[in-house]
Amino acid sequence: APVPPGEDSKDVAAPHRQPLTSSERIDKQIRYILDGISALRKETCNKSNMCESSKEALAENNLNLPKMAEKDGCFQSGFNEETCLVKIITGLLEFEVYLEYLQNRFESSEEQARAVQMSTKVLIQFLQKKAKNLDAITTPDPTTNASLLTKLQAQNQWLQDMTTHLILRSFKEFLQSSLRALRQM
């Protein structure tokens, strides 16, 4: 697994650099998670042909994965910092159950899957410190999450491969959208 942000060799080589601001830390954390997702996607794509499937075909699934929409205030048109921040945090909290599902889905990248999961928890903490309106953030129900996890793990092999691919792709795209929005803040 890659070293966490702030600890890579390039950072060590610059000991006199100014400490990272909150925004820079968040930015770097997201990029770190995206690198982890890339590694996981490589293993998934090498193992199955899911990555070749068209986005239209993949859209026909029953997963309720978080997605950005105009109303969330994260787009340049109609941008709303507070609404957007709430959406990003809520979305990441909703992704946590899917990241838990990924934990037993990888052979050579098991450590990487764990790193993505743990780094996402850290990212949520960073963002919660930045948010003013924490009351607006809805935390997923643990019981619902537990039953969803059981259901996902009971799928046949083909569906599990499809689910893994969809989670990684959706999480990647959610983070990329978040990154664009956060740089507007």
């Epitope: 990029r31 890339s38 990329q176 990154l179 956060l182 507007q184």
Partner: antibody, heavy 120, light 108 residues
Framework: SVEESGGRLVTPGTPLTLTCTVS????????MTWVRQAPGKGLEWIGT??????DTWYASWVKGRFTISKTSTTVDLKITSPTTEDTATYFC?????????????????WGPGTLVTVSS | DMTQTPASVEVAVGGTVTIKCQAS??????LSWYQQKPGQRPKLLLY???TLASGVSSRFSGSGYGTEFTLTISGVQCEDAATYYC????????????FGGGTKVVVV
């Protein structure tokens, strides 16, 4: 491949729409960007239309001067009220989707460009 | 957003040329380089600061991280005469121009 069309001579203030048509890949799978280049000048990013959420981001200088819209087969760039400063070659480019790119917008396939001349 | 130097450089065939690009804030390794010949469309050379794009000659190499980046062309050939642009990979909020101003390489 990527190809732009619609470039022509227009008078200042006359709206103009440029069209980007692609083949060999699907617009439902790739973000697309518009870049322009004034005669003898450098490349200037205008904006990018993303796939997943359908959001479009523009350079900070755009301020409503351009609008990017996407259909299933084309990506359009509307110059809302052209001025002589908008005289340029307009390029449409695909934003690659390789995992190695991470969060990085890499313009991996470009059209030949279409020339827009704004003059009275 | 991106400052490129020099604006123009002359190099002899077989020589080496170095182009620098500076970002106004840290962009990690999210930087690409493009080559554009007169009257042609730009062509992707490198991405992620140092990774060669498919089909690009190994004469081209890139390095850098954070705010300082370099493109090096070793063993310059006549066909390398072109303008080279760096591009920061963040084209989201608050970006003025994703591209550097360009460096014209003249091969003598």
């Amino acid at each position: 491949s990527v190809e732009e069309s619609g470039g022509r001579l227009v008078t200042p203030g006359t709206p103009l729409t440029l069209t980007c048509t692609v083949s060999g890949f699907s617009l439902s799978s790739y973000a697309m960007t518009w870049v322009r280049q004034a005669p003898g000048k450098g490349l200037e990013w205008i904006g990018t239309s993303y796939v997943y959420s359908g959001d479009t981001w523009y350079a900070s200088w755009v301020k409503g001067r351009f609008t990017i819209s996407k259909t299933s087969t084309t990506v359009d760039l509307k110059i809302t009220s052209p001025t002589t400063e908008d005289t340029a070659t307009y390029f449409c480019a695909r934003v690659g989707d390789y995992d190695d790119y991470g969060a990085h917008d890499v313009f991996d396939s470009w059209g030949p460009g279409t020339l827009v001349t704004v003059s009275s | 957003d991106m400052t490129q130097t020099p604006a123009s450089v002359e190099v002899a065939v077989g020589g080496t040329v170095t182009i620098k690009c500076q970002a106004s804030e840290s962009i990690s390794s999210w930087l690409s380089w493009y080559q554009q010949k007169p009257g042609q469309r730009p062509k992707l050379l490198l991405y992620r600061a140092s990774t060669l794009a498919s089909g690009v000659s190994s004469r081209f190499s890139g390095s850098g991280y954070g705010t300082e980046f370099t493109l090096t062309i070793s063993g310059v050939q006549c066909e390398d005469a072109a303008t080279y642009y760096c591009q920061q990979g963040y084209t989201g909020g608050n970006v003025d121009n994703a591209f550097g101003g360009g460096t014209k390489v003249v091969v003598v």
